[in-house]
Interface confidence: low
Amino acid sequence: LEVSESPGSIQVARGQPAVLPCTFTTSAALINLNVIWMVTPLSNANQPEQVILYQGGQMFDGAPRFHGRVGFTGTMPATNVSIFINNTQLSDTGTYQCLVNNLPDIGGRNIGVTGLTVLVPPSAPHCQIQGSQDIGSDVILLCSSEEGIPRPTYLWEKLDNTLKLPPTATQDQVQGTVTIRNISALSSGLYQCVASNAIGTSTCLLDLQVISPQPRNIG
């Protein structure tokens, strides 16, 4: 019995179906086929879970969180024992193993391993201003999304014809910050943060209004 090489890892957007491949060759009939799919979740590597089981011509559910979401892609028994997972969740990220036994065919590699990563688009980021908006001050524009896998990068842009930040601005696309030094009236305007990762984009807006000093009465 020989389980074929798997692609190594699969990425899927949260909520979308995933197919985890596992095929094998055997010299025996499929009368005594026994297939166990296990997962070692990324979130809890010490706690492997059973995903689905095929034994004695019957299918059995694995861990409760997979109930109703998992099945074999084809009619069993077969030499293609790939499974699908519907409505993938973040907690489905992990290393999946198919263990195949088909007596009396023993020996050879009977395990296939596939990594599954569930990707999450950036959630609506939160935009805020830190610091005084008085002319001549330094301000920091902050942007962060609560969710996003892979971790989002953040791009700030000023929504005018140039789409460029003021020349006094420095941007950190990993932290989602923009520092604008010595703000002037020209720094005023609408700024947008674009949070993006491999599968999605989200935005938030803020309006920076630079405050000019009020003329003083001399009396």
Epitope: S123, A124, E147, L186, S188, T203, D207, Q209
Partner: antibody, heavy 123, light 111 residues
Framework: QVQLVQSGAEVKKPGASVKVSCKAS????????MHWVRQAPGQGLEWMGW????????NYAQKFQGRVTMTRDTSISTAYMELSRLRSDDTAVYYC????????????????WGQGTLVTVSS | QPVLTQSPSASASLGASVKLTCTLS???????IAWRQQQPGKAPRYLML???????TRGGGIPDRFSGSSSGAERYLTISSLQSEDEADYYC?????????FGGGTKLAVL
Amino acid sequence: QVQLVQSGAEVKKPGASVKVSCKASGYTFTGYYMHWVRQAPGQGLEWMGWINPNSGGTNYAQKFQGRVTMTRDTSISTAYMELSRLRSDDTAVYYCARDPDGSGGSSRWFDPWGQGTLVTVSS
Amino acid sequence: QPVLTQSPSASASLGASVKLTCTLSSGHTNYAIAWRQQQPGKAPRYLMLLNSDGSHTRGGGIPDRFSGSSSGAERYLTISSLQSEDEADYYCMIWHNNAWVFGGGTKLAVL
């Protein structure tokens, strides 16, 4: 393409509540704030508040505090706006409107709105 | 809370030009605004973003007959070569403290 489809017209009695739904499609529902705006017959636009579909966090206009509740169901990409203790001056078209997307330049900017839901409050 | 003031009505002849005004309240004169158009029986649609320095960018599909300019607290929307479908309500709006603020709107009649 991006679409916001709202529930149908409602007729309510004063003192009752109304719940308007807004089903989003064509984009990541949790990626953009959803606003609610109303327009009384022959009048201007009035912002009511927003909901962050990701966290469920809300921000209501002061005028509607205590009477409006905005919720969402992310499993069906739908936002809801419920207005209670209805009065005759709540008769209006209620719009849901997604936060703008200016990514890549504001020439591509668009902020889709629903088709509007007419709520009539009459005894 | 900022206030946006618009003239309730305006009119101009077919093929002519018209300039609509939105005035920002004192203390908010640096704000960028958006202009929106609402044709009868339809939802408002985005026309353009207009910065305090007068730079503006139209939304996708908005013809270049629509242009914007700024002067101090005033934000202008100019529509040239007026067409019958330009008869509509025009609103200015800003973003302020995580909220949207709308002007009262100007009803444009094309004669």
